[in-house]
């Protein structure tokens, strides 16, 4: 039985220009996470942080993802276009995956308001 | 290359305890979770449950949760299984198995076993 | 707790016989099955893994197939060295139990 929740910064938005960090929470379980995936609205991977191997940012987000802090990832240089949404998929033994999810609003504004409250979805 | 190496065959007195050993090498032992499986003679393979080696947080199946304790030393990368209060039909070889980190799991990397033998 | 049922539980065939073992469980597991092979006297060895997917070094006369909740190992031509008793095993929740065994002998 899946007994662990994902915690999420929910919905989020920064400036154009900008960087954001995306982060998810796995809690109240004692599975053993064995990798997190980090997917775009259109199901492409950013990224893949996998406890052996550690990070691997994909090439097409090499110049705009960091790894971290933690499990989470760190987008740069925002564009209109990385308005929407991202998921975490954590991958853990023997629970099985759980997923959450951000919805970032990149906006034209220059006094952009970066909200990053922890939510449940 | 990895390796599970287990401590040598014991044999005890029923109310005995005994620890068994498994050393790990070739790999990060804290990425992988630790499982414990039991094999009585003649008898099939019973899962007793795994050890959250980032954590040292143990989780026993519903048989194992009396008499049995699984612990980790990261020092030395060895993971241990702990029966106390030894019975005759805890006589079995017990074996270390490494989950494999892809996403739908297994026991890729096994120890050769340590036979437990309980014995008046 | 999901049960496994695995049949049958002992087989004897001649070289190259094409061998089938099954094993259904009682709920969906997807495929977080495995199939390991234990040679007496040794521990076992996983062959085949997410239902499907032959492991590293394992000879491909070894496959794994699944259909709903039933899945089958097979042995596409049986040889000497295949004497052992083959275990599946569910690994998508605790208790990551195993069937109960299938012991096949060489006739």
């Known amino acids: 039985m899946m007994t662990g929740t994902i915690e999420t910064t929910g919905n989020i938005s920064a400036k154009k220009g900008g960087s954001v960090i995306l982060q998810c929470h796995l809690s109240s379980t004692m599975a053993q996470v064995t990798q997190v995936n980090w997917e775009q609205h259109d199901h492409s991977l950013l990224a893949i942080r996998n406890a052996e191997l550690g990070w691997h940012i994909y090439p097409a987000f090499k110049d705009r993802v960091a790894p971290g802090p933690g499990l989470g990832l760190t987008l740069q240089s925002l564009t209109m276009n990385d308005t929407g949404e991202y998921f975490c998929t954590y991958h853990t033994y023997p629970d099985g995956t759980y997923r959450g999810r951000i919805f970032l609003e990149v906006l034209e504004s220059s006094v952009a308001e970066h909200s990053a409250r922890f939510q449940i979805p | 290359e990895v390796q599970l190496v287990q401590s040598g065959s014991e044999l005890k007195k029923p109310g005995a305890s005994v620890k068994v050993s498994c050393k790990a090498s070739g790999y990060t032992l804290t990425n992988y979770p630790m499982n414990w499986v039991r094999q009585a003679p003649g008898r099939g393979l019973e899962w007793m449950g795994w050890?959250?080696?980032?954590?040292?947080?143990?989780a026993y199946a519903q048989d194992f949760t009396e008499r049995f304790v699984f612990s980790l030393d990261t020092s030395v990368t060895t993971a241990y299984l702990q029966i106390s209060s030894l019975k005759a039909e805890d006589t079995a070889v017990y074996y270390c198995a490494r989950t494999a980190i892809t996403s739908v799991y297994h026991f890729d990397y096994w120890g050769q076993g340590t036979l437990v033998t309980v014995s008046s | 707790d999901i049960q496994l049922t695995q049949s049958p539980s002992f087989l004897s065939a001649s070289v190259g016989d094409r061998v089938t073992i099954t094993c259904r469980a009682s709920q969906g597991i997807s495929s977080y099955l495995a199939w390991y092979q234990q040679k007496p006297g040794k521990a076992p060895r996983v062959l085949i893994y997410g239902a499907t997917t032959l492991q590293s070094g394992v000879p491909s006369r070894f496959s794994g197939s699944e259909s709903g909740t039933e899945f089958t190992l097979t042995i596409s031509s049986l040889q000497p060295e295949d004497l052992a008793t083959y275990y599946c095993?569910?690994?998508?929740?605790?208790?990551?139990?195993f069937g109960q065994g299938t012991k096949v002998e060489i006739k």
């Open positions: 050890i959250n080696t980032n954590t040292g947080s143990p």
């Open positions: 095993q569910k690994l998508n929740s605790h208790p990551c139990s």
